[in-house]
């Protein structure tokens, strides 16, 4: 029956003699009169178990203690610890020169684990061994004893165990415990593989080449490799794991990844919280799932957000030449989150009696600069056909429309060829310009061409250079344009519809809101 | 078994002397030191010395030098004590005590029956 | 030379009882203190040695402790054949035993 005690966690302990309760029983030789076991306190007060020989008035002794058969395990260089305490001669009562202050250790390998007798041929010298410390009876005061630890090493080994004995040649010494034990590598984790216990090799320079194989939830990015050292310690980890997706390195392991966390590749990242719009509900995720109405496009990363088709264009004119028509537009107020917008173009050619009979207008069409991907906002559609009802269609998409077409991305106009639009505005004057307004008036066109159904009127900062502007529509000849910025120049348009469609825009009017009210009466010439 | 055996009590006159053997059997008689402790009527135990019966050295406590000498005779594995010039304070019982030494300390552990010795006039 | 006191010069206890006796070295001795039993008109007989070692055929309600200077022998329960003088003593370069403690009937 043996206790427990901790040692390091790079030896494995074949043998413990302070472990064993009860009697060790070990065989000495001579039986009487040699070697002997007697049990002593330790500084807990608790019986240790220990032999003492002390026969240092005669000469020529020869005592032998031998240990049990002891298994060594697969190990082929073990290590024996000794501790002793050993009587200064010249302590001892009327001791002359028959008194020695060392011993001998010995060891024989045998497969046989019991074998009876001390037979001393069969053993090898492993080391003398002497004390760095002796004691006089002196010393011994407050139960605290000079123990002398040494250890040394035997290797290699072949047979299944082996036997250790102690030598005495007339000194006066007790052994207090006799351990015995190898080294290994301990099972350990480098780079997340796993390296298992490995005995140590036969020579105290040996190094032994160990696999590791990768801890669970991960795979080899290259091969891990280490080198288990004659002192139990592991050296040059070579090559790494790397976990799997959706599982990050922690302590050594890798853990799938949190709700609400994903990781896409087998990489040493770590997992990362889903992107904008998008969740995962299971640990280990190796993606987020988007959110309802978020997609993501085939060739978005997983470390993109989800995103959405944009809304539609605004601000939809279109002005009719003959068998022409030319369409202009404002990019959608929300393009989804996504760079990537672009524009198409359908076209229906429609019944006079009914616009809801439609059909698409077919190849004779023809597009400037082109049908579908428009990167631009306008474009020219010829070789239309006189007298007739066309609706445009222009809908706005970019990389995740596919997966959600809808009438709300797209904006349409119904114009007719062949009808005469009004002509163009000749004069427009700003009547009124303050720090946030500007009050517009103009004149009927010399040539309506029918009852002028509306205005329009379009506006932008100067600088924008009509990339962003604005829309305002009125049935009378004048309107104030308000929510200006102060001090800015203003480039502003204004045409006529009839029911055959748009004229052309007047000449642009430049006008630069003011710092403090004041009237400006416009003269169809550019207002500062 | 191990003993040790004294001989039987003596009377001496002040100034004689008197030797007492101490023969031992049942182990090695020059394996172990003997002792030698007196004990006089009513008191307590005094250690006298030793013998080392390998080389025949003797050691004498303090109060027992001069007239007290330590002998030996391996070949019948006896030990003597020889004291001369009684005086009446010698009386007492000498005992021999075979010493046991280790590493945890020294001590006497197989004791002769005693040998009572009487001085008187 | 170191000398040792014991404590008390007689100690009455009734047979069943503990028995405690003490020893107190005039300087720090070796804790591995024999002690001694003589019973009348015999020799002495060793009873403990090194710290606390039984020697051979004394029962396990002799047991020993202490270090530096102070020491003590107990007897857990005293049997009728326990009653005897008892003896320390310590083995410096010159030995000296203490002058004895008497354990008589109470």
């Known amino acids: 029956v043996t206790g427990s005690r901790v040692y390091p966690a790079n030896e494995v302990t074949l043998l413990d003699s302070r472990s064993v309760q009860g009697e060790l029983g070990w065989i000495a030789s001579p039986l009487e009169g040699g070697w002997e076991e007697v049990s002593i306190m330790d500084e807990k007060n608790t019986p240790i178990r220990t032999y003492q020989v002390c026969n240092v008035m005669e000469a020529s002794q020869n005592n032998w203690l031998r240990t049990d058969w002891i298994t060594r395990e697969g190990a082929q260089r073990v290590y024996i610890e000794i501790k002793f305490t050993l009587r200064d001669c010249n302590s001892l009562p009327g001791v002359m020169g028959t008194c020695k202050e060392t011993f001998n250790l010995y060891y024989y390998e045998s497969d046989n684990d019991k074998e009876r007798f001390i037979r001393e041929s069969q053993f090898g010298k492993i080391d003398t061994i002497a004390a760095d410390e002796s004691f006089t009876q002196v010393d011994i005061g407050d139960r605290i004893m000079k123990l002398n630890t040494e250890i040394r090493d035997v290797g290699p080994l072949s047979k299944k165990g082996f036997y250790l004995a102690f030598q005495d040649v007339g000194a006066c010494i007790a052994l207090v415990s006799v351990r015995v034990f190898y080294k290994k590598c301990p099972l350990t984790v480098r780079n997340l593989a796993q390296f298992p216990d490995t005995i140590t090799g036969a020579d105290t320079s040996s190094l032994v080449e160990v696999r590791g194989s990768c801890v669970n939830n991960s795979e080899e990015k290259d091969v891990p490799k280490m080198y288990c050292g004659a002192d139990g310690e592991w050296l040059v980890p070579i090559g790494n794991c790397l976990c799997n997706a959706g599982h990050e390195e922690q302590n050594g392991e890798c853990q799938a990844c949190k709700i609400g966390y994903y990781k896409a590749l087998s990489t040493d990242a770590s997992c990362a919280k889903c992107p904008p719009h998008s969740y995962s509900v299971w640990e280990g995720a190796t993606s987020c799932t988007c959110d309802r109405g978020f997609f993501r496009a085939d060739n978005d990363a997983a470390s993109m957000p989800c995103t959405r088709p944009p809304s539609a264009p605004l601000n939809l004119i279109s002005n009719v030449n003959e068998t022409s028509v030319n369409l202009e537009w404002s990019s959608p107020q929300n393009t989804g989150g996504r760079q990537d917008i672009s524009y198409n173009v359908v076209c229906k050619k429609c019944g006079a009696g009914d616009p809801s009979k439609c059909r698409p207008c077919g190849s004779g069409v023809h597009y400037t600069p082109q049908q579908n991907g428009l990167k631009t906002t306008r474009v020219s559609i010829t070789d239309l056909l006189a007298h007739t009802n066309y609706t445009f269609e222009i809908w706005a998409v970019n990389g995740v429309s596919k997966y959600n077409p809808s009438p709300d991305q797209s904006v349409s106009v119904t114009v007719t060829t062949n009808q005469a639009a009004p002509s163009s505005i000749a004069l427009v004057q700003a009547k009124e310009v303050t720090r946030y307004s500007v009050a517009l008036a103009w004149l009927e066109p010399d040539r309506p061409n029918g009852v002028i159904l509306e205005y329009e009127v379009k506006y932008y900062e100067k600088d924008q250079n009509e990339r962003s502007y604005r829309i305002v529509r009125t049935a009378a000849r004048n309107t104030d344009i308000k929510g200006l910025n102060p001090l800015t120049s203003y480039v502003f348009h204004v045409r006529a519809r009839t029911a055959a469609g748009y004229g052309d825009f007047s000449e642009p009017l430049e006008v630069t809101t003011n710092t403090v009210p004041s009237r400006i009466i416009g003269d169809g010439a550019n207002s500062t | 078994q191990v003993q040790l055996l004294q001989s039987g009590a003596e009377v001496k006159k002040p100034g004689a002397s008197v030797k007492v053997p101490c023969k031992a059997s049942?182990?090695?008689?020059?394996?172990?030191?003997m002792s030698w402790v007196r004990q006089a009527p009513g008191q307590g135990l005094e250690w006298m010395g030793w013998?080392?019966?390998?080389?025949?050295?003797?050691t004498y406590a303090q109060g027992f030098t001069g007239r007290f000498v330590f002998s030996l005779d391996t070949s019948v594995s006896t030990a003597y004590l020889q004291i001369s010039s009684l005086k009446a304070e010698d009386t007492a019982v000498y005992y021999c005590?075979?010493?046991?030494?280790?590493?945890?300390?020294?001590?006497?552990?197989?004791w002769g029956q005693g040998t009572l010795v009487t001085v008187s006039s | 030379e170191i000398v040792l006191t014991q404590s008390p010069a007689t100690l009455s206890v009734s047979p069943g009882e503990r028995a405690t006796l003490s020893c107190r070295a005039s300087?720090?001795?070796?804790?591995?203190l024999p002690w001694y039993q003589q019973k009348p008109g015999q020799a002495p007989r060793l009873l403990i040695y090194g710290a606390s070692t039984r020697a051979t055929g004394i029962p396990d309600r002799f047991s020993a402790s202490g270090s530096g200077t102070d020491f003590t022998l107990t007897i857990s329960r005293v049997e009728p054949e326990d009653f005897a003088v008892y003896y320390c003593?310590?083995?410096?370069?010159?030995?000296?035993f203490g002058q004895g403690t008497k354990v008589e009937i109470k």
């Open positions: 049942g182990y090695t008689f020059t394996s172990r030191a």
């Open positions: 005590a075979r010493v046991r030494t280790t590493v945890y300390g020294d001590n006497m552990d197989v």
């Open positions: 003593q310590q083995y410096g370069p010159s030995w000296t």
């Open positions: 300087q720090s001795v070796s804790s591995n």
């Open positions: 013998i080392n019966t390998n080389t025949g050295n003797p």
